[in-house]
């Protein structure tokens, strides 16, 4: 019988008492085969973290800073359940740390040196750790003691709880630096008052502070937020302009064998029986013998943290950067206005080889990082392990939902002004063999399908979106008799046609021979009835243009396109017979890397782009024998986006809506994780 006990870790006598009460009350409402609670008492949160790592306990609820400690080796814990605040309809699991300034003050984030600062309190998250952690490498050396460096960075501050004797500048705006509400500038409202009164130029608070202190929109409009990209935004745009997004209070467990499903089952049942306004005799979110025992008193319930989410993703790049800077105190030697090498994310070993060659030729401008799937690459870019990659539109959507931004677009048509003219897009098509003359768009049911990969534009999002509108369900593996859609569940009929060997079968990378445009077309040639690809795929792989044995004798005339009106047309008539227009592939990165990725890639394409005529004797960035490694092989240049610099603007309203409709069919664990951070 599996052990269904969750050993909860308590850090005080009062917590242990509440834990025992929790245990007893759960026993009374949950059947004997359901989850149960046991209580383990430790002296501190760090002791609880160690106990969970050592399998002496299973769960504890932590503030963000401790979630970071719990994630570090050798603890390796992960977030599994989040407390939420506010209402069930609009649950808040995170708050945003922001930098508030007066509208007419005219400086940006990178111009804070010499300004006057207002902090909620020394050592507090939004008011100190996050802003000072992010500014850490701009502080004057020596950076230790930290208070002295901060005092020398700003021209005056109010940092309640600081030592006013040793660091008088930190108390200049609030004499004495009192550590309670007796100090009018203490806490969130106090720090904002410090700004409002004109004592300081910037207040480091949380996003709700300004709304709690200024009910009137006209008053709020006198203030702005400083963004990390050195722009400003209105105070209600905090989701797009903050220093960090911080989880409020989180249950953590072991990454491996951590009982995360059991912990969720327990807490979900607990909130049903003992949540807000549920029971008089025991309340989960109430602490009669103290404050915030086991859970925060202000919590309204629990949400399950998506399984794909590790602590780094949950805490977010900015928060992790800030805390790591404060803890480790290391800064790059290079001047910050110089671009560091761009860490390109390569999928599997084939892309890695090409990336390595690029790296050698780039003379220090490009480094390479490997991952097995596109989603793993996106996650690495999010957390700073990698910086950039070029993505199909379907993944630009996921990357955008995960906070990444498009920075350059692949262009596929030769033109005089390629780099300045991003194209409208390419065509998603359905290709069939001419010999299968009875096959149309209207009778695809039961046929064998070939897809570039799950989640990609031409191979999945567009055809499956159209199909969904017809069949109104997500069971595409039942619609087609079998197929190859790399990235599907391995036991799905949509992996049956795939050709990868062993663990590589149906993997969404080049180890699966039927992956990508060329792979999906090969799948049609060898096994399938229909392939969902781009309009250039057939000409690029016929007429001897692809020398691989399977392709070298193919003829374009042996293939036709399926049109949405039920007719068929020759391959060259794609402009009048396609499923939809697809946005070109685009390079994505984090917002903080946008300028450097843009600059370095433009240099790189001038050195190794389509202007290089002899690819046998020179490295060519946009060539890989029809295998589309790192970039599509038909890329002519990487073009500026001009004002299409967010994923919504880049992909266009129509495509975003189409992918949004398909969301209910999504199997993307990364998309689920990212929408948890930003619904």
């Amino acid at each position: 019988v599996p052990d269904k006990t969750v050993r909860w870790c308590a850090v005080s006598e009062h917590e242990a008492t509440k834990c025992q009460s929790f245990r007893d009350h759960m026993k009374s409402v949950i059947p004997s085969d359901g989850p149960s609670v046991a209580c383990v008492k430790k002296a501190s949160y760090l002791d609880c973290i160690r106990a969970i790592a050592a399998n002496e306990a299973d769960a504890v609820t932590l503030d963000a800073g401790l979630v970071y400690d719990a994630y570090l080796a050798p603890n390796n814990l992960k977030p599994v359940v989040a407390e939420f605040y506010g209402s069930k309809e609009d649950p808040q699991t995170f708050y945003y740390a922001v930098a508030v300034v007066k509208k007419d003050s005219g400086f940006q984030m990178n111009q804070l040196r010499g300004k006057k600062s207002c902090h909620t309190g020394l050592g507090r998250s939004a008011g100190w750790n996050i802003p000072i952690g992010l500014l850490y490498c701009d502080l004057p050396e020596p950076r230790k003691p930290l208070e002295k460096a901060v005092a020398n960075f700003f021209s005056g501050s109010c940092a309640p709880c600081a030592d006013g004797t040793d660091f008088p500048q930190l108390c200049q705006l609030c004499p004495g630096c009192g550590c309670s509400t007796l100090n009018q500038y203490f806490g969130y409202s106090g720090a904002f008052k410090c700004l409002k009164d004109g004592a300081g130029d910037v207040a480091f608070v949380k996003h709700s502070t300004i709304f709690e202190n200024l009910a009137n929109k006209a008053d709020r409009d006198q203030y702005e937020l400083l963004c990390l990209d050195n722009t400003r935004k209105p105070v209600d745009e905090y989701k797009d302009c903050h220093l960090a997004q911080v989880p409020s209070h989180t249950v953590v467990a072991r990454s491996m064998g951590g009982k995360e499903d059991l912990i969720w089952e327990l807490l979900n049942q607990a909130q049903e029986h003992f949540g807000k306004d549920k029971s008089k005799e025991f309340q989960l979110f109430s602490s009669p013998h103290g404050k915030d025992l086991l859970f925060k008193d202000s919590a309204h319930g629990f949400l399950k943290v998506p399984p794909r989410m590790d602590a780094k993703m949950y805490l977010g790049y900015e928060y992790v950067t800030a805390i790591r800077n404060l803890r480790e105190g290391t800064c790059p030697e290079a001047p910050t206005d110089e671009c560091k090498p761009v860490k390109w994310c390569a999928l599997s070993h084939h892309e890695r080889l090409k990336c390595d060659e690029w790296s050698v030729n780039s003379v220090g401008k490009i480094e390479c990082v490997s991952a097995e799937t596109t989603e793993d690459c996106i996650a690495k870019i999010m957390n700073g392990e990698a910086d950039a990659m070029s993505l199909d539109g379907g993944f630009v959507y996921i990357a955008g939902k995960c906070g990444l931004v498009p920075v350059l677009a692949e262009n596929y048509n030769k033109s005089d002004n390629c780099e300045d003219t991003p194209e409208a897009g390419y065509f998603a098509i359905a290709v069939v063999k001419k010999s299968a003359s009875d096959l149309t768009w209207d009778n695809l049911k039961g046929k064998k399908s070939c897809h570039t990969a799950v989640g990609r534009t031409a191979g999945w999002n567009i055809p499956m979106g159209l199909l969904y509108n017809k069949i109104n369900h997500c069971r595409f593996d039942e619609f087609f008799s079998e197929g190859c859609a790399p990235g599907s569940k391995k036991d799905s009929s949509l992996c049956k046609l795939c050709m990868g060997s062993g663990l590589n079968l149906c993997e969404p990378n080049n180890k699966e021979g039927y992956y990508g445009y060329t792979g999906a077309f090969r799948c049609l040639v060898e096994k399938g009835d229909v392939a969902f690809v781009k309009h250039q795929t057939v000409p690029q792989n016929t007429g001897g243009k692809n020398p691989d044995p399977w392709a070298k004798n193919l003829n374009e005339k042996d293939y036709e396109l399926l049109c949405l009106d039920g007719t068929r047309k020759p391959v060259e008539e794609y402009a009048n017979c396609h499923l939809a227009r697809a946005p070109n592939h685009a390079v994505v990165t984090r917002k903080d890397k946008e300028a450097c990725v843009h600059k370095i890639l433009r240099q790189q394409q001038h050195l190794f782009g389509s202007n290089v005529t002899d690819c046998s004797g020179n490295f060519c960035l946009f060539r890989s024998e029809t295998k589309d490694l790192l970039f599509r092989d038909d890329t002519v240049c990487l073009a500026k986006l001009h004002d299409r610099n967010t994923y919504e603007k880049y992909l266009g309203e129509e495509y975003v809506k189409a992918v949004g409709n398909l969301r209910k069919c999504s199997t993307s664990s990364l998309l689920e994780a990212c929408t948890f951070r930003r619904p």
Epitope: K354, V360, V363, N618, F619, S624
Partner: nanobody
Framework: HVQLVESGGGLVQPGGSLRLSCVAS????????MAWYRQAPGQQRELVAG???????KYADSVKGRFTISRDNAKNTLYLQMNSLKPEDTAVYYC???????????WGQGIQVTVSS
Amino acid sequence: HVQLVESGGGLVQPGGSLRLSCVASGSIASVATMAWYRQAPGQQRELVAGITRGGSTKYADSVKGRFTISRDNAKNTLYLQMNSLKPEDTAVYYCTDYSRGYYQDYWGQGIQVTVSS
């Protein structure tokens, strides 16, 4: 395609040196990039050092300051001078000129380097 044959490996004590050679069956003068990779048991193959036709070089962080890559186009040979060897340098070393593309796995036999006391 040009054939590449590696030599010069063997057993060496920590702190010792080895020089690996990779002789090409044809001209390497017009080859854009040449590189040394290595693969330790149970690990992915990793780039150790690379050199462009113009002589620019790149090294993995773990070998910087200890290994030197060079090419002699007249002798159609790629070299890897390995100094201050450490036990973690133990691996099979391969050379490549990338000319067979990135997609097919055309790797030679490689050469074993073992660093042990």
